[in-house]
Each structure stands twice: as C-alpha cells, then as structure tokens.
C-alpha cells in the first residue's frame, strides 16, 4: 500500500527535472535480491545499500524504477543533495 | 492519522537544562523531518532547529548551537530537544513539528506538536 | 540569514472582503533546479500551535478552504484571503526554506473591521 509520501515522491521521481533523481550505476541493479527478515518483506535498501547515498537528503527507494532518490533539506541540490543553494 | 505529542509543561532555574519531547504517530518516522519552533509570550516563531531521523541530519539556527541537541529515536518515533543553561529569556512555547517534502525538497511543516510551556524562573 | 518582512503588522477587514498580507525576502526564493519559490504561510489561532496553508507560494494544502490563495515569486509574496470568514481572525506568518536558518515573518494580526 503506498503512502501519500511515496506517491508524491514517485510522481517527483518519473516527471521532474533529473536532479530529483539519483540512479547509480546499471549494474547495481542487477544483483539478486535478498529477503529480509519476515514472510518474503523485502528490506528497504536506503536503510543499508544506499545508507550513505544522500549527502544533504533522504534516500527513498523506488521500486518501479528499481533506484534511490533523493529529497533534499533545504538549500541543497543536485542528486546526491550535495550542492548548496547560492 | 498523523500525530505529534509532546511533554508536559516545565519549570526551569537559570543556568538548569531541560529535555523536552515529541513522540510521532501516524507515519513512517524517518520519511520526514522534525524541526523545532519556539514561541515566547506574545512574540512570533523562531527556528532552532530539525533532525532528520533517517538520515540523523541535524541542523541549528546559529543563535542555539551549542545549548540546543536534537536527537531521535527511531524504535519510538521520539524525537528531543534538550536545551542547556537555560535563561528567563528562554521562557516560550516550544513546538516541534513535522517537515515535509514535495517537488523533491523538504522544508514545510505540514504537522504539529500542541506545544511545551517552559518557564525559567528564579 | 534570509529576511522575511511581512507588511501590515495588523490588519482589519470587513466580513466578506478581501484581506491581503504581503510578504518580502531579503533574498531571492526561487529555486532554480524546479522554477518553485521556497515559501509557506501559516495561520495561527490563540492557545494554538500554526497551521499550514500554503506551500511552493501558491500550493494550498489539503483541507484549506479555496478563499486562501498564495502568490508571488523572487522576493515578494501575498497571501489573499477573497471572502474574509469571522474563523479566519488569527495571526499569518510566511515562512522561507529557501535555505538554512529557515526563517519566519514577525507576523501579521488579522482582526475583523
């Protein structure tokens, strides 16, 4: 069930300007993917893979595009929210 | 449905710290931010800080560095401010309230806490 | 830091008119990665914490009523109330998150004419 934040995000992610979204490497995504604790849940990767991903942000995995994002905190841009807002 | 709750109110000495806090509900706690907002007595709002508890993010107005620590606990969506050596002047209404986000940005407060009366007193 | 400088400090409409608060940056708020200015207004109410009424200077949020509108961009902004309703007497700030420290207006009194 998605969340009214996750929708937004997704809406952000698939429509806005390239700086919304952050996508490593292709190969990265190729890996298998392992269950996490619990019946067949599968652990969000922003909470260990990509922990560190966001600079100045916070990481949103999107499943759909199988990616991280970032939602940056204020003054920041750019994918990883690495830059500073002049 | 989304909820902030914070301590109840708190009265202080010159020079003491006080732990005030804020238990969320209703939400994924580490999707947002939870940034602080004071109110003395008739005055407007000012800013002293947020964390970001997925991230563990903080940042402060300049004007609390160093007596204002922010701090979050995940396992139960609580977040704190304490504030050290206190003063008269810290006498206000502290809120804390939820940060959110759009457009990929964050910066709104779209949720609050009912408040935190502290009084500092002699 | 970012100014923000509301004008009037307060305010007194008739029910039914019109109320308008001005708001004004010591700096530019549009972001120029998403073309969107960085401002939120709040309502407040005695013994109340505030209420968010608009983000992005012109999103309203959800649940608040059509009569509130934002607009605006760079560094002056408004927000308009169109038919003033007697729930509506109460304290508005804007508020910047263009960058840190996020600041807030000193405020403006709305009271009924």
């Known amino acids: 069930d998605l969340q009214e934040a996750d929708l937004d995000l997704l809406r952000v992610t698939l429509s806005s300007k390239p700086q919304a979204l952050a996508t490593p490497n292709k190969e990265e995504h190729g890996k298998r993917k392992k269950k996490g604790k619990g019946l067949g849940k599968k652990r969000d990767p922003c909470l260990r893979k990509y922990k560190d991903f966001c600079i100045h942000g916070e990481c949103k995995y999107v499943k759909e595009l199988r990616a991280p994002s970032c939602i940056c905190h204020p003054g920041y841009h750019g994918e990883r929210c690495h830059g500073l807002s002049l | 449905q989304v909820q902030l709750v914070q301590s109840g109110a708190e009265v202080k000495k010159p020079g003491a710290s006080v732990k005030l806090s804020c238990k969320a509900s209703?939400?994924?706690?580490?999707?947002?931010?939870i940034t602080w907002v004071r109110q003395a007595p008739g005055q407007g709002l000012e800013w002293i800080g947020e964390i970001f508890p997925g991230s563990g993010n903080t940042y402060y107005n300049e004007k609390f560095k160093g007596r204002a620590t922010l701090t979050a606990d995940k396992s139960t969506s609580t977040a704190y401010m304490e504030l050290s050596s206190l003063r008269s002047e810290d006498t206000a209404v502290y809120f804390c309230?939820?940060?959110?986000?759009?457009?990929?940005?964050?910066?709104?407060?779209?949720?609050w806490g009912q408040g935190t009366l502290l009084t500092v007193s002699s | 830091d970012i100014v923000m400088t509301q004008s009037p400090d307060s305010l007194a409409v008739s029910l039914g008119e019109r109320a308008t608060i001005n708001c004004k940056s010591s700096?530019?708020?549009?972001?120029?990665?998403?073309?969107?200015?960085?401002l939120a207004w709040y309502q407040q109410k005695p013994g109340q914490p505030p209420k968010l009424l608009i983000y992005w200077a012109s999103t309203r949020e959800s649940g608040v009523p059509d009569r509130f509108s934002g607009s605006g961009s760079g560094t002056d902004f408004t927000l308009t109330i169109s038919s003033l309703q007697a729930e509506d007497v109460a304290v508005y700030y804007c508020?910047?998150?263009?960058?840190?420290?996020?600041?807030f207006g000193q405020g403006t009194k709305l009271e009924i004419k």
């Open positions: 508020q910047q998150y263009y960058r840190y420290p996020l600041t």
């Open positions: 700096q530019s708020l549009l972001y120029s990665t998403n073309q969107k200015n960085s």
């Open positions: 209703g939400y994924t706690f580490r999707t947002y931010g």
């Open positions: 309230a939820r940060e959110s986000f759009s457009d990929g940005y964050y910066g709104y407060f779209d949720y």
